[in-house]
């Protein structure tokens, strides 16, 4: 957030940018959490996403029996590895073709035992609040499909009649990692030292990271005619003075008529 400064006072402003703000010759460029002419104000809402997509990674091991292991397969830049990678990727693309969340495979290691293929199956889905269920279902389908293909595509009389053949017992799922999206945690982190005062509220299934100074939410602080301002000790109402009234109180809800006070003073003098 930026505020432009014109005139003689600008040089003074330059040295007074607060909260890590930097002077660009015209104005203070404020870090994400701050705004105002001097970056002196704390924002009342922080954009926390959500991300467009959520990813999952399944660590799998399969044993390919239609290729004999050679030392060259350990070298990822060798012609042997590159050819194996191409065939294995094509085979897995066929195996997982019915899974909309499937992105691809990534071979991490090839080792002896016919060819033991340690690899990751990569999944991705659009973010919705149900993303965990969607990815959990996809990982179950991956398990079913790889189990099926490694049971069906096997060597017969020492020859494979498929693109690749497998050892039925060599298929294992080592680990499943889903990218965790935790709006509460993100909100707390991005609010930094004000983290205790920012909360997540949902609107149309979208999370909003807000402080009580953001109007229109259930946690919003009503400062009446005053202004809500965030400080390290929490949100506070800065009360205004009008031509006719002074306002005070925690929510600036106590108004004192100036004329009454002045009248009172005149009476005493």
């Amino acid at each position: 957030r930026t505020t432009t400064c014109f005139g003689d006072g600008c040089q003074n402003t330059a040295s007074r940018c607060k909260n890590g703000g930097t002077w660009d010759g015209l104005k203070c460029q404020c870090p994400n959490l701050y705004y105002g002419e001097l970056c002196e104000e704390v924002v009342s809402s922080i954009d926390i996403g959500p991300p467009e997509t959520i990813s999952a990674q399944m660590e799998l091991t399969v044993t390919v029996t239609s290729v004999k292991f050679t030392e060259e397969l350990k070298n990822h830049s060798s012609q042997e590895f590159q050819e194996f990678k191409q065939t294995f990727t094509e085979q897995m693309n066929i195996v997982y073709s019915g899974i909309p969340e499937y992105v691809g495979v990534n071979i991490t290691k090839l080792r002896l035992g016919s060819v033991v293929v340690e690899h990751d199956v990569l999944l991705r889905t659009k973010y919705t609040p149900e993303y965990k269920t969607v990815l959990d279902n996809a990982t179950e389908v991956v398990k079913e499909k790889i189990t099926k293909v490694t049971t069906q595509q096997i060597m017969i009389n020492d020859i494979c009649s498929d693109m690749m053949c497998f050892n039925t017992t060599g298929t294992q799922v080592q680990n499943i990692t889903v990218t965790q999206y935790d709006p509460e945690e993100d909100c707390r982190k991005m609010a930094k030292e004000y983290g205790d005062y920012f909360v997540v509220e949902y609107r149309d299934q979208k999370p909003y990271c807000i402080s009580p100074c953001e109007p229109g939410f259930s946690v919003s602080k009503n400062c009446n005619l005053g202004k809500c301002q965030m400080s390290l000790s929490g949100p506070q109402c800065l009360c205004v003075t009008t031509e006719t009234h002074w306002y005070s109180g925690e929510t600036c809800n106590q108004g004192t008529q100036k004329s009454l006070v002045y009248g009172h003073h005149h009476h005493h003098h």
Epitope: S66, V67, K68, T70, C160, S161, M163, C165
Partner: nanobody, 123 residues
Amino acid sequence: DVQLQASGGGSVQAGGSLRLSCAASDNTFSRGSMSWFRQAPGKEREGVAIISSDGWTGYADSVKGRFTISQDNAKNTLYLQMIGLKPDDTAMYYCAASFLVLRALNPKAWHYWGQGTQVTVSS
């Protein structure tokens, strides 16, 4: 780029014999595998025979006992000796190669292909 060129095809009577050759541009596949495939009109390409650098050979059931695959690494050449030819053996014959020590007679497992040579067996 690896080049494979098949030759030796022709027309023979049933029961006759032919020897096919496949010349590779270099000895790249001496540590991998080479194979012969064939494709009859209107049919899918099918595996005939395979030889690997470890000396292993494999054959399709339909040609076992009649066809013999071999290679001469010094000449970078693959051979297919065919005897007792039948009209069913009529097809375009292709050689294929791989850097991998393969045990697969599915064309999708093979990445490098030569031009075909036609074999016609009449009754």
